[in-house]
Interface confidence: low
Amino acid sequence: SWMWNQFFLLEEYTGSDYQYVGKLHSDQDRGDGSLKYILSGDGAGDLFIINENTGDIQATKRLDREEKPVYILRAQAINRRTGRPVEPESEFIIKIHDINDNEPIFTKEVYTATVPEMSDVGTFVVQVTATDADDPTYGNSAKVVYSILQGQPYFSVESETGIIKTALLNMDRENREQYQVVIQAKDMGGQMGGLSGTTTVNITLTDVNDNPPRFPQSTYQFKTPESSPPGTPIGRIKASDADVGENAEIEYSITDGEGLDMFDVITDQETQEGIITVKKLLDFEKKKVYTLKVEASNPHVEPRFLYLGPFKDSATVRIVVEDVDEPPVFSKLAYILQIREDAQINTTIGSVTAQDPDAARNPVKYSVDRHTDMDRIFNIDSGNGSIFTSKLLDRETLLWHNITVIATEINNPKQSSRVPLYIKVLDVNDNAPEFAEFYETFVCEKAKADQLIQTLRAVDKDDPYSGHQFSFSLAPEAASGSNFTIQDNKDNTAGILTRKNGYNRHEMSTYLLPVVISDNDYPVQSSTGTVTVRVCACDHHGNMQSCHAEALIHPTGLSTGA
């Protein structure tokens, strides 16, 4: 049987002669040269050679465990004379022994990491990893220990894990943002003679909100004319904040001062400035100076830094209102006046009043804007503002007159203002009622007495307060001996009724009825209208067949045969 132990060979042999591996030996070998040893398998005849007589194996080249740690070969022993094997072919292993010939190599040449500023000591930053190609199962050639070469006292590294942590309290980004840390990985458990590699870790402190906003000055002063409309920007204030991004966002607000209701502050999103704007109309004559307390605050506050103090700052803003020569101001925004339509020329309707609001109290003169009163129906006393008529009025022509009055400062004609005047013309009963339409009707020759042949309606241009109340009657000259009667329905209508049985169209073909229509207002107005009644031949249903004259233009009469 074969006689050998496992073969071991040290890697990276540097000797000048071949490296002895070991001896293949069969217990059948009597040492007389009758046996021949043959080697086959991994590297046989090239890397490994065998003395076929003695079985001694040598390595011809320097071997690298990291390239190939194990070689598997086969051994044969044969009888030189017969060529027959004296041992079964057997597999054996040459194991390459490790030496510490590889330094640790980091997975990255440069690491990049971030950690919030002001982090607690021991806060995780990043983990670095180095690998060593040597044999981890044998000795300490691959046992890596991490240490920090550069970056203390700010950061530390855990020797076994490569975890980098913060090592100093209160690291402030606003003081220093970037750190370059150099980490060494050393094998042999960090002992003397170990091989080492290094890597660079670039660490950036990210911002936290640890700085409040600060106004660079405690007082600001701005001026604005009293004429500034609401929304007008007056000035800009800016607080600075050493933080960045959303931690540097600033919100401005007015927290106190007499101008609290008069002014606003808007945050300009782009510039992070506070824009002071006018909120309500200013009046130099009422108040010339306002003082505001404006606050700048961080909307995104981190509770853990509240101990550093309030994340806000205040400044005083003084606003000086500048005087502007203002136009006169009317006592009302608009005036509504009324006058009867029968008013005589020069009748006073009412008056307007305007005053210069400035301290000078310049006198004012009044005038009518003639573009709004082209017909010069009204006039105004330039001194006292009294409005009076200069022409006769007619409500039925125009109910409302809309005119504009101008008030002008006598000493400064450029300063003027305008006010609308709405003048309502009140109704007077100055129009008579009249027929609503032209009435022409017919009566059948065989009509019976008291038949309704036409209903009358009236209209009136006036507009009495309690509504129209018309009365209808035959004119006095036609009332006696008339062939028809008028029946007043007391509802502003009246009916024409036949007064006799039968009409002869050959005797009288047409009747003209004068009807008096009166209103019941003061003074009473009345008019006379004429109704034409034609006598016609009718069928037994009372339908008109023929009349003495031409065919009726308006056959509006009611059937009388019924």
């Epitope: 990210t206 960045v244 991004g245 959303e246 966002e249 945050t267 909307p299």
Partner: antibody
Framework: QVQLVESGGGLVKPGGSLRLSCAAS????????ISWVRQAPGKGLEWVGF??????????NYAAPVKGRFTISRDDSKNTLYLQMNSLKTEDTAVYYC???????????WGQGTLVTVSS | DIQMTQSPSSLSASVGDRVTITCRAS??????LNWYQQKPGKAPKLLIY???NLQSGVPSRFSGSGSGTDFTLTISSLQPEDFATYYC????????FGQGTKVEIK
Amino acid sequence: QVQLVESGGGLVKPGGSLRLSCAASGFTFSSYAISWVRQAPGKGLEWVGFIKSNADGYTTNYAAPVKGRFTISRDDSKNTLYLQMNSLKTEDTAVYYCARIRYFRNWDYWGQGTLVTVSS
Amino acid sequence: DIQMTQSPSSLSASVGDRVTITCRASQTINSYLNWYQQKPGKAPKLLIYRASNLQSGVPSRFSGSGSGTDFTLTISSLQPEDFATYYCQQGDSSWTFGQGTKVEIK
């Protein structure tokens, strides 16, 4: 003037992927956080996710229904925002808007939207 | 997650009417409440931010109020162009929207 223009929408099968873009102009793009918002047909608005600015470390945050499937990125040199949508589901069908996030956590400018339809 | 509940979900009103929409948060949101208007086929438009601040260019008939959990959007005199859907949005803890209020013509 400020403008946001979305593109890249279209029809995709369930399980598929799509990449939306949002091109910005008229403002300093790199200084602003930008959000993606979506609106399913006939439904209300739903926040998808956002990416902060360079000054805030390009932090991203996502709504629960899309976390792990959608990724927001940006290229400040091109003034462009991206939304990479993977493992799409039928319930992701919506008009997708990008919107500029202003201070005080409101969205002052929006794009016109791009329609994404997920259907087999 | 913070839930936002808007009421009513829809309302009918006439031009000139005063309209009020309310929004309630499931927990306090420190005034980080925004209101948006959206018209069909269009992107939402910011009206009010931080509960009561009028966005630049928005008519003054729109106003917002409230703090903590209860907020209100008021349109003092409804105009024809105001018929739209209105959404509230909280920005205190990530973002969530109300379900919307549709303002229709009566």
